[in-house]
């Protein structure tokens, strides 16, 4: 049985496996998926007090 929700992670830390461009790692599914399948936090308005985190689930560089 597939493990539970350990996923929805960003690329702030090294993913367990690299993804090709235009793909992002879904740690729950344990594989790379199209980045458009994963939803990121709402962008903060300009001048927000909290710095915008790097949560875009961008492809591995």
């Amino acid at each position: 049985m597939r493990r539970g929700p350990r996923s929805l992670r960003g690329r702030d830390a090294p993913a367990p496996t690299p993804c090709v461009p235009a793909e992002c790692f879904d740690l729950l599914a344990r594989h790379c998926v199209a980045c458009g399948l994963l939803r990121t936090p709402r962008p903060k308005p300009a001048g927000a007090s909290s710095p915008a985190p790097r949560t875009a689930l961008q492809p591995q560089e």
């Epitope: 597939r2 493990r3 539970g4 929700p5 350990r6 996923s7 929805l8 992670r9 960003g10 702030d12 830390a13 090294p14 993913a15 729950l28 599914a29 998926v33 458009g36 399948l37 994963l38 939803r39 990121t40 936090p41 709402r42 909290s50 985190p53 949560t55 689930l57």
Partner: antibody
Framework: EVQLQESGPSLVKPSQTLSLTCSVT????????WNWIRKFPGNKLEFMGY???????YYNPSLKSRISITRDTSKNQYYLQLNSVTTEDTATYYC???????????WGQGTTLTVSA | DIVLTQSPVSLAVSLGQRATISCRAS??????????MHWYQQKPGQPPKLLIY???DLESGIPARFSGSGSGTDFTLTINPVETDDVAIYYC?????????FGGGTKLEIK
């Protein structure tokens, strides 16, 4: 903006099956994760499970084999089925969707369920 | 399951003062250098509202009076200064390990 709306019965008898619908607008349920959460009288919150972009489901083990989450992508709806309900299932049921880290930033307004004979 | 223990259970704070709510996890909720801890506010008749995610990141549209800190097993939500509109129940939630779990809640009141 994503909007979620729960619908279903407000009263179910013990041993019956609860069926709830979450209707989603503003995003497709073929992306992201789509959760069910409930809040019991006394304010305890419980994560019940989800269905994700690929149709993969996860269920809280506390619900054993009583729970099923399904979806209809053509209607952009997902569903909760909870079998053999008891009075302990009396709660407010929410559908919600999380962003990157599992933090749920969009919620339905909730539907209150009473299980009573 | 990871158990989240919130303290205090209830809290009365004067307007304009600081409110501090603690959430302790039974095991670390850190993974890949990220703390998978989030904070919500819930008012009667409303769904929970996300305030803070990833321990310290302010959700879009949430006032900077709200802040979060911590890592590993010990986390804190701070509201400074407290306003009348902040009367609510506050919950922590972890998404580090399945199943996701919530703290028992802290009820904030105005003194």
């Amino acid at each position: 903006e994503v909007q979620l709306q729960e619908s279903g019965p407000s009263l179910v008898k013990p041993s019956q099956t609860l069926s709830l619908t979450c209707s989603v607008t503003g995003d497709s349920i073929t992306r992201g994760y789509w959760n069910w959460i409930r809040k019991f009288p006394g304010n305890k919150l419980e994560f019940m499970g989800y269905i994700n972009y690929s149709g993969t489901t996860y269920y809280n083990p506390s619900l054993k084999s009583r729970i099923s989450i399904t979806r209809d992508t053509s209607k952009n709806q997902y569903y909760l089925q909870l079998n053999s309900v008891t009075t302990e299932d009396t709660a407010t049921y929410y559908c919600a969707t999380p962003h990157t880290y599992g933090a749920m930033d969009y919620w339905g307004q909730g539907t209150t369920l009473t299980v009573s004979a | 399951d990871i158990v989240l223990t919130q303290s205090p259970v209830s809290l009365a704070v004067s307007l304009g003062q600081r409110a501090t709510i603690s959430c302790r996890a039974s095991e670390s909720v850190d993974d890949y250098g990220i703390s998978f801890m989030h904070w919500y506010q819930q008012k009667p008749g409303q769904p929970p509202k996300l305030l803070i995610y990833r321990a310290s990141d302010l959700e879009s549209g949430i006032p900077a009076r709200f802040s979060g800190s911590g890592s590993g097993t010990d986390f804190t939500l701070t509201i400074n200064p407290v306003e009348t509109d902040d009367v609510a129940i506050y919950y922590c939630q972890q998404t580090s390990k399945d199943p996701w779990t919530f703290g028992g809640g802290t009820k904030l009141e105005i003194k």
